[in-house]
Amino acid sequence: PPRGRILGGREAEAHARPYMASVQLNGAHLCGGVLVAEQWVLSAAHCLEDAADGKVQVLLGAHSLSQPEPSKRLYDVLRAVPHPDSQPDTIDHDLLLLQLSEKATLGPAVRPLPWQRVDRDVAPGTLCDVAGWGIVNHAGRRPDSLQHVLLPVLDRATCNRRTHHDGAITERLMCAESNRRDSCKGDSGGPLVCGGVLEGVVTSGSRVCGNRKKPGIYTRVASYAAWIDSVLA
């Protein structure tokens, strides 16, 4: 099943997030992703855990997953590079870089997103945008078109409380509020964008969605700048 969900959001303006990618397995949406360079998409390492024998591709320039759109194009993956420290049973280092088979054709609907290189926390309360094609309600309805939601950043000390994430949130992770509006598993790998800059990537660990005591967890890209640069080099 797709790893993803935007709860309590709304349909995004078509092609207004030209960095948005759908990571696909055997032709079906699996995870979100974000175009960070002409030939590279950043996603979550856990997304490919169950994809050993399947064909992984990346869809760029899409709003609708099913309808024909002039800007849509499906790219094969030349190389998948999970973070070397990512492990199946933890949320730490949950990053994946996918090298496309060729450079993406850039245009108004396909454009890399600048990512944060300054390793400094986003201030709590800052509204950030998360988008994805994950299911939109607890009944499991999957959207055809891209959804998004604005979420306030939550401070790490609150996020680490016993009834929240009980000490699991390291300096390399950040949290966003989850009170009925939330990202969830199927949005894994998708972007958390604050002030027009990529700050986080949705982690793909198992988590209750839409419960305010279980905030969304995002991998802070600034904390992995050296690794991202080394792979893209």
């Epitope: 709590p124 790490r156 000390a157 009834t163 994430h165 009980d166 000490g167 209750v208 419960n211 005591k213």
Partner: antibody
Framework: QIQLVQSGPELKKPGETVKISCKAS????????MNWVKQGPGKGLKWMGW????????TYADDFKGRFAFSLETSASTAYLQISNLKNEDTATYFC?????????WGQGTLVTVSA | DVLMTQTPLSLPVSLGDQASISCRSS???????????LEWYLQKPGQSPKLLIY???NRFSGVPDRFSGSGSGTDFTLKISRVEADDLGVYYC?????????FGAGTNLELK
């Protein structure tokens, strides 16, 4: 390794003020809230509240509103508990306890004795 | 506040015995997220409490498998399969599901 080191024992008179410190090391201080727990002589444990080490916002249990104040010196990775207008019933050992996982990390405790 | 009632308050044992401590909460302590934040702590004389068990039955790192926790709803139990000298002290149950978080009064595990 993670350590919480508290200040030494205090002998105070009723009506005075005491300020206990709790210095954290081995982790990033602002990422985990700090709780305070009271243990009267020969008694059980009572949660007093916690302070958000990221925002500085304190939360007090009902029995500890008024004379009790939690504060921080983030640059020194230190949390403080201040008790004003001390009463005999404040005689106890006070523990600082880090949030997450559970209450796995405790200070060694600070004994405050209030006696005329 | 959620009242945590422990029984017995004192438990004399011989080394090698099995020991069982009961804890009853005045309210169901299952949290809205489906977890039950019931923990057990051991405090030895002159020391700080140490976390043994979290979320009813999960042993904290380094805790021997002689310790086991069980229960649900309002009734919880800590069992020590073979008591060793190092296990003596006061055991506290604790609920972290409802604010204010609360401890039981403690059970003193002592030698007969």
């Amino acid at each position: 390794q993670i350590q919480l080191v508290q200040s030494g024992p205090e002998l105070k008179k009723p009506g005075e003020t005491v300020k206990i410190s709790c210095k954290a090391s081995g982790y990033i201080f602002r990422n985990y809230g700090m709780n305070w727990v009271k243990q009267g002589p020969g008694k059980g444990l009572k949660w007093m509240g916690w302070i958000n080490t990221y925002t500085g916002e304190p939360t007090y249990a009902d029995d500890f509103k008024g004379r009790f104040a939690f504060s921080l010196e983030t640059s020194a990775s230190t949390a403080y508990l201040q008790i004003s207008n001390l009463k005999n019933e404040d005689t106890a050992t006070y523990f600082c306890v880090r949030d997450g996982p559970g209450f796995a990390y405790w200070g060694q405790g600070t004994l405050v004795t209030v006696s005329a | 506040d959620v009242l945590m009632t422990q029984t017995p308050l004192s438990l004399p044992v011989s080394l090698g015995d099995q020991a069982s401590i009961s804890c009853r909460s005045s309210l169901i302590i299952e949290h809205s997220d489906g977890n039950t934040y019931l923990e057990w702590y051991l405090q030895k004389p002159g020391q700080s409490p140490k976390l043994l068990i979290y979320k009813v039955s999960n042993r904290f790192s380094g805790v021997p498998d002689r310790f086991s926790g069980s229960g649900s709803g309002t009734d919880f139990t800590l069992k020590i399969s073979r008591v060793e000298a190092d296990d003596l002290g006061v055991y506290y149950c604790f609920q972290g599901s409802h604010v204010p978080v609360t401890f039981g009064a403690g059970t003193n595990l002592e030698l007969k």
